[in-house]
Structures are given as structure tokens and as C-alpha cells.
Interface confidence: medium
Amino acid sequence: KVFGRCELAAAMKRHGLDNYRGYSLGNWVCAAKFESNFNTQATNRNTDGSTDYGILQINSRWWCNDGRTPGSRNLCNIPCSALLSSDITASVNCAKKIVSDGNGMNAWVAWRNRCKGTDVQAWIRGCRL
């Protein structure tokens, strides 16, 4: 599923991401835009043999199990395929674990490079939330 901007903002808010660990909803929508272009089925391979999955591009070396990433930790205790569902529950729950890990949203390279320090509220402007 490819979400609309406001559609995703509403879904993320429903799942409790607004101000989760101090990160406003705009941060999460911005991260999703630049990680996956709002596409729940996005997958991207990394040079270390791992793969990033879903709307927030969660990595198989640390957070989920795709059955083929050497030394996978699977810290979210889920199959990576669950992160590709049109229902973003699994991605949100795992993202909450990631953002609580110490580095906050710096764990998402796209957020660090494209969202951090910008007017992230623009990503939810005009949305009926």
C-alpha cells in the first residue's frame, strides 16, 4: 500500500507515534516519506547482506528476521515480511522499540539527512487529525 501523506499521519497518530519519545508526528511522516516514499512494501538491500523492510525501512540485521541475514538479532521478534503489511501496526511497534534504543530517530539515516532540523510540521499541515 502507498499511503497518502495525511492518511499516514492519521494512522501513525492512531498508533501512538505523535510525540513518542519526544518526536512529533511530523518527524515520523517525514521519515516515512524519505525512507520508503510512503510505500509499505518497500524493500532495499544493504551492502552488509541485510535488507530494509517497510514504510520505515526497518533493518533485518537488528530488528526483524528474514531468514537470511547472517547474525540477525531480531530484536523486535517479528518476521520482516510483517513489516510489509498494509497494516502498519508491526512497523510502528518495532519503530517504538528502535527509537527507544538510545539513538532516538538518528537510527533512520533518511530522517537524519532529510528531516532533522527542518520544519517537519509541514508534513502534517492541512491534515485533519
Epitope: 524493500t43 547482506g49 531468514g67 537470511r68 541475514t69 547472517p70 518476521p79 515480511s81
Partner: antibody
Framework: QVQLQESGAEVMKPGASVKISCKAT????????IEWVKQRPGHGLEWIGE????????YYNEKFKGKATFTADTSSNTAYMQLSSLTSEDSAVYYC?????????WGQGTTLTVSS | DIELTQSPATLSVTPGDSVSLSCRAS??????LHWYQQKSHESPRLLIK???QSSSGIPSRFSGSGSGTDFTLSINSVETEDFGMYFC?????????FGGGTKLEIK
């Protein structure tokens, strides 16, 4: 137990297309990558690419881009590989395998012969 | 692409002999190297995953070692059913690649 059952041997004419199937049983089909491998005598084993059935995500070996197209039907637990614009170079045995990094489960292979 | 070079291309042995097959990678692949046996007109069968982990149901005479660029598959006391082709495969990066194979034949 995990099993991959491939479609039967094919004899095709040059320029034609063929679609090979791989039916999976014994595991959750949507959650594992399906890999496709080509084997020709004297050429060893070549990785063609892979598909994640649950999302339809695909990756192709550059060498096979434009030649192979992967699809999957999660309702029938079947992965497909279509090979187009066939030439004699495409004559080979084609295997599907479950992608665990390593390939512990293989189909029995589909023999494709391209001949005029 | 990572190139895997297997040697020797052919190995002629007598049942009861112990043998070592080599697989060398063109760059470091950590332990992401797997070994397969293939008999004529059959699909490959996984023997060893991640350089040294035996696959289920594989006889204990098969063992693997190595890391980085140099890997070895050892068969302790070859049996007649072991003759065939042996391939290595890397899963360190894409595209996945295979070695050219070693043919184990009866002397």
C-alpha cells in the same frame, strides 16, 4: 515438511517466452524469498534473482534483467519465472530454492530446451 | 561481483580416502559461505552453511572450515555415495554467486 515442486520440462522455439512455476508447501510462503538459479553444463550454477512473495519485491542479477520476470501468487503458494525472447543460450535446468541466505530447499528443476 | 574459485576442478579418490576441497573468494565474505553436493540429474543438496555449520541430516564425515577468503570442505573417509559435484556459494552480497564446482570421482 518444506517442499518446492516445479513445473515440467519445456521445449520452446527461439524468440518465444516460457513461464516456469514453483509451488511451495510446508512453510509460510509469503515470508521467505524465493530464489531462481540457472544451471547449464559447463557453466555451473548462476543466480538469476529473487522474489518476496508477500510483497512482490524483486531483485534481479544484472545479467538477467530483461530476460527473466518473477511473479508470485500467495493464494496458491506458487512463484513463477517468465523467460522471454528465448535463444539457445537459455537452454538449461532452472531451479527455484527457498532463500535463507543458504539454499536448504530446492525444487527438482525444470529443463528448458530451446530449439528450432 | 564476488568470484568464487574452487580447486581442484576434479579430484580422483578411492573410497576410504579423506579429502579436502577448496573454495577461494575474490574478497572477504566473513563466514557467509555454503557448500552443496550435487549428483547427476539431481538438485543440489545443502551440506554446510555459514562455513562450518552442518545441515540437518548430513553425515558427520562432512565438515567445513574457513573465514574471510579461504574455505575448505573436508570429507573424512569418502564413501561411494559421496561421488559427484561439489559447489560453494556466497551470501555475503548480491548477486549471489557460486563456485565453478569440484568433481569428486572414483579413482
Amino acid at each position: 515438511q518444506v517442499q518446492l515442486q516445479e513445473s515440467g520440462a519445456e521445449v520452446m522455439k527461439p524468440g518465444a517466452s516460457v513461464k516456469i512455476s514453483c509451488k511451495a508447501t510446508g512453510y509460510t510462503f509469503s515470508t521467505y524469498w524465493i530464489e531462481w538459479v540457472k544451471q547449464r553444463p559447463g557453466h555451473g550454477l548462476e543466480w538469476i534473482g529473487e522474489i518476496l512473495p508477500g510483497s512482490g519485491s524483486t531483485y534481479y542479477n544484472e545479467k538477467f534483467k530483461g530476460k527473466a520476470t518473477f511473479t508470485a501468487d500467495t493464494s496458491s503458494n506458487t512463484a513463477y519465472m517468465q523467460l522471454s525472447s528465448l535463444t539457445s543460450e537459455d537452454s538449461a535446468v532452472y531451479y527455484c530454492a527457498r532463500g535463507d541466505g543458504w539454499y536448504g530447499y530446492w525444487g527438482q528443476g525444470t529443463t528448458l530446451t530451446v530449439s528450432s | 561481483d564476488i568470484e568464487l574459485t574452487q580447486s581442484p576442478a576434479t579430484l580422483s579418490v578411492t573410497p576410504g580416502d579423506s579429502v579436502s576441497l577448496s573454495c577461494r573468494a575474490s574478497q572477504s565474505i566473513s563466514n557467509n559461505l555454503h557448500w552443496y553436493q550435487q549428483k547427476s540429474h539431481e538438485s543440489p543438496r545443502l551440506l554446510i552453511k555459514y562455513a562450518s555449520q552442518s545441515s540437518s541430516g548430513i553425515p558427520s564425515r562432512f565438515s567445513g572450515s574457513g573465514s574471510g577468503t579461504d574455505f575448505t570442505l573436508s570429507i573424512n573417509s569418502v564413501e561411494t555415495e559421496d561421488f559427484g559435484m561439489y559447489f560453494c556459494q556466497q551470501s555475503n552480497s548480491w548477486p549471489r554467486t557460486f563456485g565453478g564446482g569440484t568433481k569428486l570421482e572414483i579413482k
